[in-house]
């Protein structure tokens, strides 16, 4: 059950997809990736208030228990629900090759 | 790539499975669940320091960017990697039924 998409904290404050520009140096990839030189990293950032984009029953339980025991149980967390593949040109022992990574760029987000 | 399981913050401080005892009232289930009266909720709690139980490439990127831009990019988060099913006896219009939920109890944890 993917619950409400209305953010009670105000526009853009809740769990959603953000894009962060990063260089190969930022990512620690400069020694093994040739291209792209810069990556538009899509990631999930934002708060997960009660039932906002709850991924499943576990997330709903976590919300309930966080309300009761905030020092013991953390609130649900904003994480990728799915990914977009990304292609890198990487250095190999024999030259270069195209490599597709399935789990690199977040495609959409939920709270869990 | 599931990275190191050694916690640099000290024993038990990093992302791992915890059990939290909760009543039906705690969970807000008293009106639709008959049994069990109490649930041993397994959930993922703890810090995700650099590369600890990194679920995938996205988690590794998040670690790198959090180090560079801690105010913009959050650290990876401790979430379920898989679930154990749980059976509930729930009230229905016609009586009671057994219902299995696949996404209720965390089985193991990783950082993402």
């Amino acid at each position: 059950a993917r619950n409400g998409d209305h953010c009670p904290l105000g526009p853009g404050r809740c769990c959603r997809l953000h894009t962060v520009r990063a260089s190969l140096e930022d990512l620690g990839w400069a020694d093994w990736v040739l291209s792209p030189r810069e990556v538009q990293v899509t990631m999930c950032i934002g708060a997960c208030p009660s039932q906002f984009r709850a991924a499943n029953m576990h997330a709903q339980i976590k919300t309930s228990l966080h309300r009761l025991k905030p020092d013991t149980v953390p609130a649900p967390c904003c994480v990728p629900a799915s990914y977009n593949p990304m292609v890198l040109i990487q250095k190999t022992d024999t030259g270069v090759s195209l490599q597709t990574y399935d789990d690199l760029l977040a495609k959409d987000c939920h709270c869990i | 790539a599931r990275n190191g399981d050694h916690c640099p913050l000290g024993p038990g401080r990093c992302c791992r499975l915890h059990t939290v005892r909760a009543s039906l009232e705690d969970l807000g289930w008293a009106d639709w669940v008959l049994s069990p009266r109490e649930v041993q909720v397994t959930m993922c709690i703890g810090a995700c320091p650099s590369q600890f139980r990194a679920a995938n490439m996205h988690a590794q990127i998040k670690t790198s960017l959090h180090r560079l831009k801690p105010d913009t990019v959050p650290a990876p988060c401790c979430v379920p990697a898989s679930y154990n099913p749980m059976v509930l006896i729930q009230k229905t219009d016609t009586g009671v039924s057994l219902q299995t939920y696949d996404d209720l109890l965390a089985k193991d944890c990783h950082c993402i």
Partner: nanobody
Amino acid sequence: QVQLVESGGGLVQPGGSLRLACAASGFTLDAYAVGWFRQAPGKNPEGVSCISSSDGSAYYADSVKGRFTISRDNAKNTVYLQMNSLKPGDTAVYYCAADLSCPVQIATFHSRGQGTQVTVSS
């Protein structure tokens, strides 16, 4: 209308060859890098090959290196993928896409065709 159209797919026996074409209309392809992707049923898309716009540098996935060759014919506004020594594992829908530079990205490319089916089976 700006579009890419793939052709040349079909059914071929293991060890056989096919030449796929990616023809552009509505824009000049020589200003763009062109990538070929494939997607097998139930699997994620995979980058297969890319040819840059600037110097014609070609890049290949390890799984096709030495068997596939990418080339461009600017006069025909077309990029080709010559596929030799085909294997059952090459069975997929093949797409082409254009972007400013290699590697062309699956999620963010400027234009993409509808694909052409390649089936390798005896």
